[in-house]
């Protein structure tokens, strides 16, 4: 499955929008910094086939979309930027969804892929718990915004590598 050219443009737009969403200086939130343990090994693109990589990318974008679709998120960010960001993620989900279905049809997720999907889910669990513990404070959201920028960059790079493989 070839992801459309608009998909990579959408990735870039999402990152730009997320950068624009920053409301407070990252430096004023240094005390709130946290290591969420991003599962880099799931995004290095070496250990699995394209089909599996797309499933993991889908999980990553889906969890990001869910995180920024909550009521707490709506209260934290400027509404029009948040809506545009969510729209970009939604389009990416549609592209990836079509690819997952096209690549393998609807079938059981390969065993190796299962642990990758769980690793992504656990990563977002850690982010969710952090926000809960920090009572969704502005600094907590700023730390999470910076973290998601980093994780989306990894996703974008993996997608570039997948296109080069084609």
């Amino acid at each position: 499955c070839d992801l459309p050219q608009t998909h990579s443009l959408g990735n870039r737009r999402a990152l730009i929008l997320l950068a624009q969403m920053g409301r407070i200086s990252h430096f004023s939130c240094l005390k709130d910094r946290h290591d969420f343990g991003f599962p880099e090994e799931e995004f290095d693109g070496h250990q699995f086939q394209k089909t599996q990589a797309i499933s993991v990318l889908h999980e990553m974008i889906q969890q990001t979309f869910n995180l920024f679709s909550t009521e707490d998120s709506s209260a934290a960010w400027e509404q029009s930027l948040l809506e545009k960001f969510s729209t970009e993620l939604y389009q990416q989900l549609n592209d990836l969804e079509a690819c997952v279905i096209q690549e393998v049809g609807v079938e059981e997720t390969p065993l190796m892929n299962v642990d990758s999907i769980l690793a992504v889910r656990k990563y977002f669990q850690r982010i969710t718990l952090y926000l809960t513990e920090k009572k969704y404070s502005p600094c907590a959201w700023e730390v999470v915004r910076a973290e998601i920028m980093r994780s989306l960059s990894f996703s974008t790079n993996l997608q570039k590598r997948l296109r080069r493989k084609d």
Epitope: L96, V100, V106, E108, D115, K122
Partner: antibody
Framework: QVQLVQSGAEVKKPGASVKVSCKAS????????MHWVRQAPGQGLEWMGE????????IYNENFKSRVTMTRDTSTSTVYMELSSLRSEDTAVYYC????????????WGQGTLVTVSS | EIVLTQSPATLSLSPGERATLSCSAG???????LYWYQQKPGQAPRLLIY???NLASGIPARFSGSGSGTDFTLTISSLEPEDFAVYYC?????????FGQGTKLEIK
């Protein structure tokens, strides 16, 4: 509000198959994995597997792998769990439960569907 | 597969008393992925505590959770009549996800 409504009770003969449905409402259906958990009479809970309604991929518990099939219909926001080669030990209440994160993990359950396997 | 063993199987106490329910894992479970559910007859399970120690929405403060590694505990500080039910611990730290066999909390 989030609601999961399951199909009604079923009585099946050994060797037959059963298909239980779970209709979701109150949230975006394709955003969350849906799980199936069963409970035999007087017994504990057993996780059977999960399906991503967005693309239909599944993850099954090895104990059920050869007999279970989970599917979804996005047009009706419904997931299905089909169990084949039924035996008396499969007599149980089958629940669907929505995934999520933090306080949303298995926070929403269907009302349960009793499947009785008897000759 | 991570086996979760709950003890005791049945706990007989009176309203007002303190209840301590244990959940022991066959191998280490990260506390972020250990949950507790309450189930009453004829009903679906209800989320009580998530990530070992966090109270789910609408759950009274008399419920609390603690533990790490392989040993986890659910405590009810002062039992109310509506607390008598079956309690399950659950992990989603690794596939397949598993539940304990349950502890039945009954009125003495």
């Amino acid at each position: 509000q989030v609601q999961l409504v399951q199909s009604g009770a079923e009585v099946k003969k050994p060797g037959a198959s059963v298909k239980v449905s779970c209709k979701a409402s109150g949230y975006t259906f394709t955003n969350y994995w849906m799980h199936w958990v069963r409970q035999a009479p007087g017994q504990g809970l057993e996780w059977m597997g999960e399906i991503n309604p967005s693309h239909g991929r599944t993850i099954y518990n090895e104990n059920f792998k050869s007999r279970v099939t989970m599917t979804r219909d996005t047009s009706t926001s419904t997931v299905y769990m089909e169990l084949s080669s039924l035996r008396s030990e499969d007599t149980a209440v089958y629940y669907c439960a929505r995934g999520g994160l933090g306080p949303a993990w298995f926070a929403y359950w269907g009302q349960g569907t009793l499947v009785t396997v008897s000759s | 597969e991570i086996v979760l063993t709950q003890s005791p199987a049945t706990l007989s106490l009176s309203p007002g008393e303190r209840a301590t329910l244990s959940c022991s894992a066959g191998s280490s479970v990260d506390s972020s992925y250990l949950y507790w559910y309450q189930q009453k007859p004829g009903q679906a399970p209800r989320l009580l505590i998530y990530s070992t120690s966090n109270l789910a929405s609408g759950i009274p403060a008399r419920f609390s959770g603690s533990g790490s590694g392989t040993d986890f505990t659910l405590t009810i500080s002062s039992l109310e009549p509506e607390d008598f039910a079956v309690y399950y611990c659950h992990q989603w730290s690794s596939y397949p996800f598993t539940f304990g066999q349950g502890t039945k909390l009954e009125i003495k």
